[in-house]
Interface confidence: medium
């Protein structure tokens, strides 16, 4: 029950996280104009990964897409790539995790298969979350660097003229959405990985294996112990045959026609 809850919660948390990553990637407010000490308050500039916008005090907004690839900074391209990779991995993870959910029955899928799928989706969510966090952090770092460069430039050149209209940019809402969404996806992934362990418990069943001679005397060979794990071929405690070997569960006290030397 706890495993199902952990898996289900992990799925929901990851779903919210990936929706957040998609939202952040599409948002225009990755960087917003710093209004502190800015005389041009009638217009407000902000940018996203795909276009830049300017809003008038009346509310009218004009947005223009970045119609060039070559003119964009390599770091911006890297951020775009990280966010897209995060979304793709997250989407695949969601698809895999739907089939891995314990509460959903698909044919005669064994718990071991569900465990493997849960682990796979969990890892995908973790990588997806890390991609989003990395992308947002790289962009934030670029902004911070540019902010202080702009601040330095404000008091140089054109005899202080630059200070009059210099626009500095600070963190936009999308950065915070991205950080939170990446964190949620990461947490969801960890929860899926934890649930995976519960789905496929490490069972170690030591079974004494008896060997029957064709005669009435019973010989026991040492070393016939078999450890069964949740991921092995003997997950259902199937009969283990080794020549004429039988598990202790089904040992017969007298020889039968099925006993071989």
């Amino acid at each position: 029950m706890a495993v199902t809850a952990c898996q289900g919660l992990g799925f929901v948390v990851s779903l919210i996280g990936i929706a957040g990553i998609i939202a952040a990637t599409c948002m225009d407010q990755w960087s917003t104009q710093d209004l502190y000490n800015n005389p041009v308050t009638a217009v407000f500039n902000y940018q996203g990964l795909w276009r830049s916008c300017v809003r008038e005090s009346s509310g009218f907004t004009e947005c223009r897409g970045y119609f060039t690839l070559l003119g964009l900074p390599a770091m911006l391209q890297a951020v775009r790539a990280l966010m897209i990779v995060g979304i793709v991995l997250g989407a695949i993870g969601l698809l895999v995790s739907i089939f891995a959910l314990k509460c959903i029955r698909i044919g005669s899928m064994e718990d071991s298969a569900k465990a493997n799928m849960t682990l796979t989706s969990g890892i995908m969510f973790i990588v997806s979350g890390l991609c989003a966090i990395a992308g947002v952090s790289v962009f934030a770092n670029m902004l911070v660097t540019n902010f202080w460069m702009s601040t330095a430039n404000m008091y140089t050149g054109m005899g202080g003229m630059v200070q009059t209209v210099q626009t500095r940019y600070t963190f936009g809402a999308a950065l915070f959405v991205g950080w939170v969404a990446g964190g949620l996806t990461l947490i969801g992934g960890v929860m899926m990985c934890i649930a995976c362990r519960g789905l496929a418990p490490e069972e170690t069943n030591y079974k004494a294996v008896s060997y029957h001679a064709s005669g009435h005397s019973v010989a026991y060979k040492p070393g016939g112990f078999k450890a069964s794990t949740g991921f092995g071929s003997n997950t259902k405690n199937k009969k283990i045959y080794d020549g004429g070997a039988r598990t202790e569960d089904e040992v017969q006290s007298y020889p039968s026609k099925h006993d071989y030397v």
């Epitope: 960087s31 217009v43 500039n45 940018q47 830049s52 916008c53 300017v54 809003r55 008038e56 009218f60 907004t61 004009e62 223009r64 970045y66 964009l72 900074p73 911006l76 670029m142 902004l143 540019n146 702009s150 003229m161 630059v162 209209v165 210099q166 626009t167 500095r168 940019y169």
Partner: nanobody
């Protein structure tokens, strides 16, 4: 080679009109918001007006509202400032400034044109 060249300045009587032009070259003009900034003798620089890259967003400083009109022609890579009902306090050097809509691109400045309002 990026260039911003202002023209149209001169001596005009109070109540008169002037039309300033700012011709741009060397960059994608339509991607840049264009500003007019002025500096009167012995005073600090003052922002006058701004027009967005597409021309849809326009704003003016309170001191010039209703008297000045900013416009741009992206086909000609030129911005204009129509100044009507000029006052002596409008006397200044007028500079045009091209400011990218994105923070990773440079801003560009013209050398300025002198406007003198005097009787």
């Amino acid at each position: 080679q990026v260039q911003l060249v202002e023209s149209g300045g001169g001596l005009v009587q109070p109540g008169g009109s002037l039309r300033l032009s700012c011709a741009a070259s060397g960059f994608t003009f339509s991607n840049y918001a264009m500003y007019w900034v002025r500096q009167a003798p012995g005073k600090g620089p003052e922002w006058v007006s701004v027009i967005s890259g597409g021309g849809g967003v326009i704003s003016y400083a309170d001191s010039v509202k209703g008297r000045f009109t900013i416009s741009r022609d992206n086909a000609k890579n030129t911005m204009y400032l129509q100044m009507n009902s000029l006052k002596p306090e409008d006397t200044a050097v007028y500079y045009c400034n091209a400011q990218s809509a994105v923070w990773w691109e440079n801003d560009y400045w013209g050398q300025g044109t002198q406007v003198t309002v005097s009787s």
